[in-house]
Interface confidence: low
C-alpha cells in the first residue's frame, strides 16, 4: 500500500491521542534505555510504511502484536485516514482462519514496540534530518 | 538493486579463528534482522545464527554456541561472524541472508552469494 | 528441536509437467496468531539459495505463479504446476517457528 495520499495530521492526532499511550502501557516495566532505536524512516509514507509492517507482519520471534490495543487503533487510524488501506486489508484478514487466542509477550515483542515508538517518534518530525 | 556481500572466508587450521564479514546495500540494513545460514559440500543448508535490528537479541546453533559470534554495526550496514575453535565440521559455504526474524515471518528473502570456510591442517 | 522431513529425496520431471514435493515437521508449525512458519527456498545449481514461497503459500517477489504452496500444522506441499527446465536444483523448506530454525533436506529436481 502507499501511504502517500494519508492526511497526516489526522494520523499524528490519532498517535497523540491514544496510540502512543498505548505504546506506553505495552512497555510498563521496561527501562527506556533497554532498547536501541535502530529503525529509521525518512519521511511520512516511509514511516507509514514500517510502521505496518512491524506492527501487523508476523515475525519468528515476536507473533502477537496484531491484537495488542496500539496495534487496533493504528489499524483503525490507517483505515479511515488513508483512502483505500481498508481494502487492502481485507483479503489479508478473510484468509485468516478463526482460532483462539492467547496472549504471549516476549522480549522479541518489547525490541519491536521500543523500534515502533522510534518510528511513530519520527513520523511526527517529519522534517528533522536523518542521524 | 539489494545486495549482501560476504569477505573473510579461507582455510584455516583445526582450532584456529576466522572472521566473517557481510556489506548489505540497497536496503535500509537497520531495519533487518540477519542471518548466518551455512552448507557443508554435497550437503543442505543448516541455519547458523540469527541477530535482530538492534542486536537486542542473539540466537545460535547448538553446534555453534560458545565458539561462534554474530555482531552488526547499523552505522556501516555491516554483518560479522567471528569463528573460534573452529573444527573440520564448520566447512562450509556461509552465507549471509536478510531475515530470520523481521519480516515475512522470518524467511530469508535475501541470500548474499557465499563465502568458503575449509578447516583442515 | 523441530525436525524437517522432506520427500521425495530427489525427483525427475519432463518440462511441462506439474511436481510436487512434500515437506513434513515434527510438530505443529502453526502460532496462536494464526500464521504458520513454513518457507520454501529453491538452490538452483551453482547459485545461492533462494526465497519462492513464506508463511505456506505467500509467493515471494518475482517468483512465477507456476509455483505454489499449501499445507497446515505439520503437512506441506510444493507444486510446480508446469516444470520448466530452469526450474531444476533443490528444493528446500524451512521451519522459523522456533529456533534453532531448521531445514529439510531438499529435494533435487531433475528434467527428463
Known amino acids: 500500500y502507499d501511504f502517500t495520499n494519508c492526511d497526516f495530521e489526522k494520523i499524528k492526532a490519532a498517535y497523540l491521542s491514544t496510540i502512543s499511550k498505548d505504546l506506553i502501557t505495552y512497555m510498563s516495566g521496561t527501562k527506556s534505555t533497554e532498547f536501541n532505536n535502530t529503525v529509521s524512516c525518512s519521511n511520512r509514507p516511509h514511516c507509514l510504511t514500517e510502521i505496518q509492517s512491524l506492527t501487523f507482519n508476523p515475525t519468528a520471534g515476536c507473533a502477537s502484536l496484531a491484537k495488542e490495543m496500539f496495534a487496533m487503533k493504528t489499524k483503525a487510524a490507517l483505515a479511515i485516514w488513508c483512502p483505500g488501506y481498508s481494502e487492502t486489508q481485507i483479503n489479508a484478514t478473510q484468509a485468516m482462519k478463526k482460532r483462539r487466542k492467547r496472549k504471549v509477550t516476549t522480549n522479541k515483542c518489547l525490541e519491536q514496540v521500543s523500534q515502533l515508538q522510534g518510528l511513530w517518534r519520527r513520523f511526527n518530525r517529519p522534517l528533522l534530518k536523518q542521524q | 538493486e539489494v545486495q549482501l556481500v560476504e569477505s573473510g572466508g579461507g582455510l584455516v587450521q583445526p582450532g584456529g579463528s576466522l572472521r566473517l564479514s557481510c556489506a548489505a546495500s540497497?536496503?535500509?540494513?537497520?531495519?533487518?534482522?540477519m542471518t548466518w545460514v551455512r552448507q557443508a559440500p554435497g550437503k543442505g543448508l543448516e541455519w547458523v545464527s540469527s541477530?535482530?535490528?538492534?542486536?537486542?537479541?542473539?540466537y545460535y546453533a547448538d553446534s555453534v554456541k560458545g565458539r561462534f559470534t554474530i555482531s552488526r554495526d547499523n552505522a556501516k550496514n555491516s554483518l560479522s561472524l567471528q569463528m573460534n575453535s573452529l573444527r573440520a565440521e564448520d566447512t562450509a559455504v556461509y552465507y549471509c541472508t536478510r531475515g530470520g526474524g523481521a519480516y515475512y515471518g522470518g524467511s530469508l528473502d535475501v541470500w548474499g552469494q557465499g563465502v568458503l570456510v575449509t578447516v583442515s591442517s | 528441536d523441530i525436525v524437517m522431513t522432506q520427500t521425495p529425496l530427489s525427483l525427475s520431471v519432463t518440462p511441462g509437467e506439474p511436481a510436487s514435493i512434500s515437506c513434513r515437521s515434527s510438530?505443529?508449525?502453526?502460532?496462536?496468531?494464526?500464521?504458520?512458519?513454513l518457507h520454501w527456498y529453491l538452490q538452483k545449481p551453482g547459485q545461492s539459495p533462494q526465497l519462492l514461497i513464506y508463511l505456506v503459500s505467500h509467493r515471494a517477489s518475482g517468483v512465477p505463479d507456476r509455483f505454489s504452496g499449501s499445507g497446515s500444522d505439520t503437512d506441506f506441499t510444493l507444486k510446480i504446476s508446469r516444470v520448466e527446465a530452469e526450474d531444476v536444483g533443490v528444493y528446500y523448506c524451512?521451519?522459523?517457528?522456533?529456533?534453532?530454525?531448521?531445514f529439510g533436506g531438499g529435494t533435487k529436481v531433475e528434467i527428463k
Open positions: 510438530q505443529s508449525l502453526l502460532h496462536s496468531n494464526e500464521y504458520t512458519y
Open positions: 541477530i535482530t535490528f538492534a542486536s537486542s537479541y542473539i
Open positions: 524451512e521451519q522459523t517457528l522456533q529456533t534453532p530454525f531448521t
Open positions: 540497497g536496503f535500509t540494513f537497520s531495519n533487518y534482522d
